[in-house]
């Protein structure tokens, strides 16, 4: 946890004191924010935001949709965060299927994982079709998969996020990429 000189306002402390936490579906999430000037907890995932004014955030029976970033903020506007993954074998991905890209820019396929301990977190073409040869992507289990430098030829490309589980591919819902020309 951060340490600051006396007199200077410091960020809140969170228990458990780690940047990432993995819990099983159905288990309890219990996060404690210690700060005399506690203001609120904020939860964020995809486009969803929730707030809680209690300094202890308790979710009695965690669901996959409780996966996300939990941020505690104090009266000085300083904050500290913990990211919680809720492992649910029946729901490996959270998805926001809107997928727009501008030509020559990067775009994010929003399929964060509920469990980071997976193999080959990747993009796959729909119906077993290969991805374009020049398509490159950067995976981030907390955010999704970033497609690098979108080409005009990718317009209407059908994609799934994918992980390997016990020798088989598990696919997310499908995404259709809409590309806006650069000019």
């Amino acid at each position: 946890q951060p340490s600051v000189s006396p007199g200077e306002p410091s960020p809140p402390s969170i228990h458990p004191g780690k940047s990432d936490l993995i819990v099983r579906v159905g288990d309890e999430i219990r996060l404690l924010c210690t700060d005399p000037g506690f203001v609120k907890w904020t939860f964020e995932i995809l486009d969803e935001t929730n707030e809680n004014k209690q300094n202890e955030w308790i979710t009695e029976k965690a669901e996959a949709t409780n996966t996300g970033k939990y941020t505690c903020t104090n009266k000085h506007g300083l904050s500290n965060s913990i990211y919680v993954f809720v492992r649910d074998p029946a729901k490996l991905f959270l998805v926001d299927r809107s997928l727009y890209g501008k030509e020559d820019n990067d775009t994010l396929v929003r399929c964060p994982l509920t469990d980071p301990e997976v193999t080959n977190y990747s993009l796959k073409g729909c119906q077993g079709k290969p991805l374009p040869k020049d398509l490159r992507f950067i995976p981030d289990p907390k955010a999704g998969i970033m497609i690098k430098s979108v080409k005009r030829a990718y317009h209407r490309l059908c994609l799934h996020c994918s992980v390997d589980q016990e020798g088989k591919s598990v696919l997310s819902e499908k995404f259709i990429l809409k590309v806006r020309p650069a000019f």
Epitope: P116, Y121, F137, P139
Partner: nanobody
Framework: QVQLVESGGGLVQAGGSLRLSCVAS????????MGWFRQGPGKEREFAAA????????YYADSVKGRFTISRDNAKDTVYLQMNSLKPEDTANYYC?????????????????????WGQGTQVTVSS
């Protein structure tokens, strides 16, 4: 600058096991995705396995799936490749790789153009 030093290569019989290690020095090891590529005699360099900076999310080429396991120990600035059920076709020079922002292509193959740092390699020979 990151320096990568591999060890653990050697001669092993088909069906045997080896564990490769790669120690990183320099920048913050825990911020980098790490992985292994290999180059067999007369072949192009190919991707074998990778592990993201979180230490949990892994990638394997089809040719090594189910036989090789990649892991990392951020406290020791080390990445490992446990190789089981080795085959003669696994004979190659094995190179450790590090990337701050690894880029992948179809099939979860780490594109070596996005590798920031390479090790010198360690030789693995599998005899039949």
């Amino acid at each position: 600058q990151v320096q990568l030093v591999e060890s653990g290569g050697g001669l092993v019989q088909a069906g045997g096991s080896l564990r490769l290690s790669c120690v990183a020095s320099g920048r913050t090891f825990s911020s980098y995705a790490m992985g292994w590529f290999r180059q067999g005699p007369g072949k192009e360099r190919e991707f074998a396995a990778a592990i993201l900076s979180n230490g949990l999310t892994t990638y394997y080429a089809d040719s090594v799936k189910g036989r090789f396991t990649i892991s990392r120990d951020n406290a020791k600035d080390t990445v490992y490749l446990q190789m089981n059920s080795l085959k003669p076709e696994d004979t190659a020079n094995y190179y450790c790789a590090a990337a701050f922002t690894p880029e992948f292509r179809d099939g979860g193959i780490w594109d070596d153009a996005s590798v920031d740092y390479w090790g010198q390699g360690t030789q693995v020979t599998v005899s039949s």
